[in-house]
Every structure is written in structure tokens, then in C-alpha cells.
């Protein structure tokens, strides 16, 4: 069915991290081009990536308008050089994506330990509050701004001389942990949204260890 010499897109897949959101699909076009439309449940379809030979479309600008809405995208196929052509139903051949709710589904990007500071037997570990592409009042919001208390960080820490890990959790971007005086520790953090059903955890941050550049030490 559909327009002669065009095939419908398939394997429509959302790829999203910290709200940077790209729709990918197959196949690589042969004598055809694609246009993407995206809508919330309002059915107000907006066209993007007009007549492209790419098999991906950056939809970030649309989904960041309201990350708690649920979105659907559809990919239209047109014969190259004849984009006015329509299918047997009087419209171009198209396929729908799965539904996508950014707030519930965007992957949490790998966090970064911004700094750690030791004061006596306490260490303050600070996680970088990553900027997202979500805007409010013309300023970009951080991950914490968007998720608020829904987002927690888990800290994994261990003595450099052993492998036994301890954990701590925070609803802010800072940890204050007790350490043994005179011991060096290593740290790694993970972003977590406990209320989620999918994509609950980020990958672990790179490991940072005391005695390296990011640390500050005070007696």
C-alpha cells in the first residue's frame, strides 16, 4: 500500500539523554525522503526535518516545551523529487513512533563529581548540576531544576586501600560523609529517579580519588 516506490519507516526509536531527544528510524532512504511530525495528545501536529535523507530528527526543541507531556511522532515517506505524491489513502505513507514522555523516560546522563573537600574526618562531595536544554524564562534549567526532589544521587565510596564500598544518598547535589582520618578514599556517583519504572539510574560517574586534583584538604 502507499505511494509507488516508497517504503514506510520502521523501527522508530526515541534516543534521549537529559532531554536531548532524537528520533531514529530505518531504512536508509533509496529514492525517497522523509518528513517528521510530532504532537502531544492535543493532535496539533508540527512538521520537522522536512524532506530529509537522514534517518534521525532532533526533536529536542519540541519536547522541552513541556517535558511532562506525552509525545508521539510520525515519519512520512515521499518519493525523492516528487514530494507532492500521496498514497492510496490520499495521504503520504507514514508510520507512528511509540509514545514518549520525556520526564519519565529520558535517560539520566552520566554525572560528574565537581569537587570534594575534606575537613577533618568529614568529606563534602559535590555533584555537578548538569544543564539541560529545558528552558524557563529564557534560561536553561539544570537537571535538579527540572526533577526537583524526584532526583536523588547515590554516592559510592571506598578506601583506596580496600574494595569494600559504602553508599550514601542525597536529595541535593551534595554529600557529607564520615571518613577515617589519614585514609584516602575514592568516589563515584549515580543519578537515580526512584519513582520511575524505566531508566531509573544513570551510569556511574568517573571515579575520583582523594590525593588527586579535584580535592581540597583542610585540617
Amino acid at each position: 500500500s502507499g505511494t509507488t516506490n516508497t517504503v514506510a519507516a520502521y523501527n522508530l526509536t526515541w534516543k534521549s539523554t537529559n532531554f536531548k531527544t532524537i528520533l531514529e528510524w530505518e531504512p536508509k532512504p533509496v529514492n525517497q525522503v522523509y518528513t517528521v511530525q510530532i504532537s502531544t495528545k492535543s493532535g496539533d501536529w508540527k512538521s520537522k526535518c522536512f524532506y530529509t535523507t537522514d534517518t534521525e530528527c532532533d526533536l529536542t526543541d519540541e519536547i522541552v516545551k513541556d517535558v511532562k507531556q506525552t509525545y508521539l511522532a510520525r515519519v512520512f515517506s515521499y518519493p525523492a523529487g516528487n514530494v507532492e505524491s500521496t498514497g492510496s489513502a490520499g495521504e503520504p505513507l507514514y508510520e507512528n513512533s511509540p509514545e514518549f514522555t520525556p520526564y519519565l523516560e529520558t535517560n539520566l546522563g552520566q554525572p560528574t563529581i565537581q569537587s570534594f573537600e575534606q575537613v577533618g574526618t568529614k568529606v563534602n562531595v559535590t555533584v555537578e548540576d548538569e544543564r539541560t536544554l529545558v528552558r524557563r524564562n529564557n534560561t536553561f534549567l539544570s537537571l535538579r531544576d527540572v526533577f526537583g526532589k524526584d532526583l536523588i544521587y547515590t554516592l559510592y565510596y571506598w578506601k583506596s586501600s580496600s574494595s569494600g564500598k559504602k553508599t550514601a544518598k542525597t536529595h541535593t547535589n551534595e554529600f557529607l560523609i564520615d571518613v577515617d582520618k589519614g585514609e584516602n578514599y575514592c568516589f563515584s556517583v549515580q543519578a537515580v529517579i526512584p519513582s520511575r519504572k524505566v531508566n531509573r539510574k544513570s551510569t556511574d560517574s568517573p571515579v575520583e580519588c582523594m590525593g588527586q586534583e579535584k580535592g581540597e584538604f583542610r585540617e
Epitope: 502531544t40 495528545k41 492535543s42 493532535g43 496539533d44 495521504e91 507512528n96
Partner: antibody, heavy 118, light 106 residues
């Protein structure tokens, strides 16, 4: 609770006009496409028209195109169907429905009856 | 327009029976199909969307399957409340309904 309540049905002569209304409550009206579906006596369901949340996109079945106009007033949470040049075959129960993406109908009103007869 | 054909048009069954209703599309509609239940004098009620996704609050004895042109609605164990007319609806290209299947008491 999500509710849809149709009104405006009645008896009208062939060639006449009617305006149906559908009052919505229990959800953010402008966030959803809405539609009208009708059912002639003893018959199956027939899609009539759909409108997007902003009102910017409208779709019609061929059987009503040029005669019926769908519209909405988001400030009043109300959907409308203006029916002109009515025919005997337009006689039906008219249902208003909430229609995510304009695709399927997840909440329906109880319906209002339109009878076109001389 | 895409035509939707339901079979059978009438089905006689008993409480506890496994019931299957078929819906065929005149061309491929992928998984863009919904199922509704309607009782006499009442509005239709959404049961299934996207061919197999169960609408919130619908009993798990209802299930949908299929893709492309052939779809089925299955009621695993028919209950007294399930005697009604069932409609399929495609939403791949505009909207069209099947003619309905009436499930009546044997």
C-alpha cells in the same frame, strides 16, 4: 472524574441546521484532540469529525464534508458541531469523545439524538 | 479509505467461554487499532488501543493481538457483564470502524 456531556440534539427538517455542544470537565481540555462519532438507529459507529487541541487542525468524514463544521472554545471547555443542510441519513445519536492525538477515543459522552425528518 | 471487516457479526456464547472476535483491515494499519465495547442505549467504552494495550481499568480477561491487517480481541472467560457489541477501529489513516460483533447469550 473525566466527563463529557452533549446537548443540542432534537428534531429538524431536511435542509435545516443544528448546533451540538459538548461540555467537558475533569481534564485539561486544550491538551486533547476531540471528536464526534455518530450511530444511526440499529447501525454501527461512524466517525464524523476531529479537531486538534488548539483548534488549528480539523478533519471530516466525506459524508459530512462541506456541511458540518467542528470547533471548540477552550476557555469554556466546550466542543461544538455545527450541522447544516441536514439530511435524513444524518439521523443518529451523536457522541462527543476525547481523542488522544486524534487517533482513538478514550472517553465518550452519553450522546445526544438528532432526528432529521419532515 | 481503509475498510474494516469484523467477523462474526453475531456470536453466541456462554459464561466462562473463551471468545475471539476478528477484525481485518483492507490494507496494513500496523498496530494502529482500537477495540470498544458498547451496551444497548449506552456510549461505547474503550477496551484496547494500539492493538494490544489494555486501557486503564479494563479487566485483564480482555486482550488484543495482531498487526498489519489481521487483529483479534479475546475474552479469556466470558462474564455476564461482557454480553455486548464490540467494535474495532483503525486510526492509521483517518478513522474507520468495523461493523460490530454482537456477543449474545447462547
Amino acid at each position: 472524574e473525566v466527563q463529557l456531556l452533549e446537548s443540542g440534539g432534537g428534531l429538524v427538517q431536511p435542509g435545516g441546521s443544528l448546533r451540538l455542544s459538548c461540555a467537558a470537565s475533569g481534564f485539561t481540555f486544550s491538551d486533547y484532540a476531540m471528536g464526534w462519532v455518530r450511530q444511526a438507529p440499529g447501525k454501527g459507529l461512524e466517525w464524523v469529525s476531529t479537531i486538534s487541541g488548539s483548534g488549528g487542525l480539523t478533519y471530516y468524514a466525506d459524508s459530512v464534508k462541506g456541511r458540518f463544521t467542528i470547533s471548540r472554545d477552550n476557555s469554556k471547555n466546550t466542543l461544538y458541531l455545527q450541522m447544516n443542510s441536514l439530511r435524513a441519513e444524518d439521523t443518529a445519536v451523536y457522541y462527543c469523545a476525547k481523542a488522544p492525538y486524534g487517533y482513538y477515543m478514550d472517553v465518550w459522552g452519553k450522546g445526544t439524538t438528532v432526528t432529521v425528518s419532515s | 479509505d481503509i475498510q474494516m471487516t469484523q467477523s462474526p457479526s453475531t456470536l453466541s456464547a456462554s459464561v466462562g467461554d473463551r471468545v475471539t472476535i476478528t477484525c481485518r483491515a483492507s490494507q496494513s494499519i500496523s498496530s494502529w487499532l482500537a477495540w470498544y465495547q458498547q451496551k444497548p442505549g449506552k456510549a461505547p467504552k474503550l477496551l484496547i488501543y494500539k492493538a494490544s494495550s489494555l486501557e486503564s481499568g479494563v479487566p485483564s480477561r480482555f486482550s488484543g493481538s495482531g498487526s498489519g491487517t489481521e487483529f483479534t480481541l479475546t475474552i479469556s472467560s466470558l462474564q455476564p457483564d461482557d454480553f455486548a457489541t464490540y467494535y474495532c477501529q483503525q486510526y492509521k489513516s483517518y478513522i474507520t470502524f468495523g461493523g460490530g460483533t454482537k456477543v449474545e447469550i447462547k
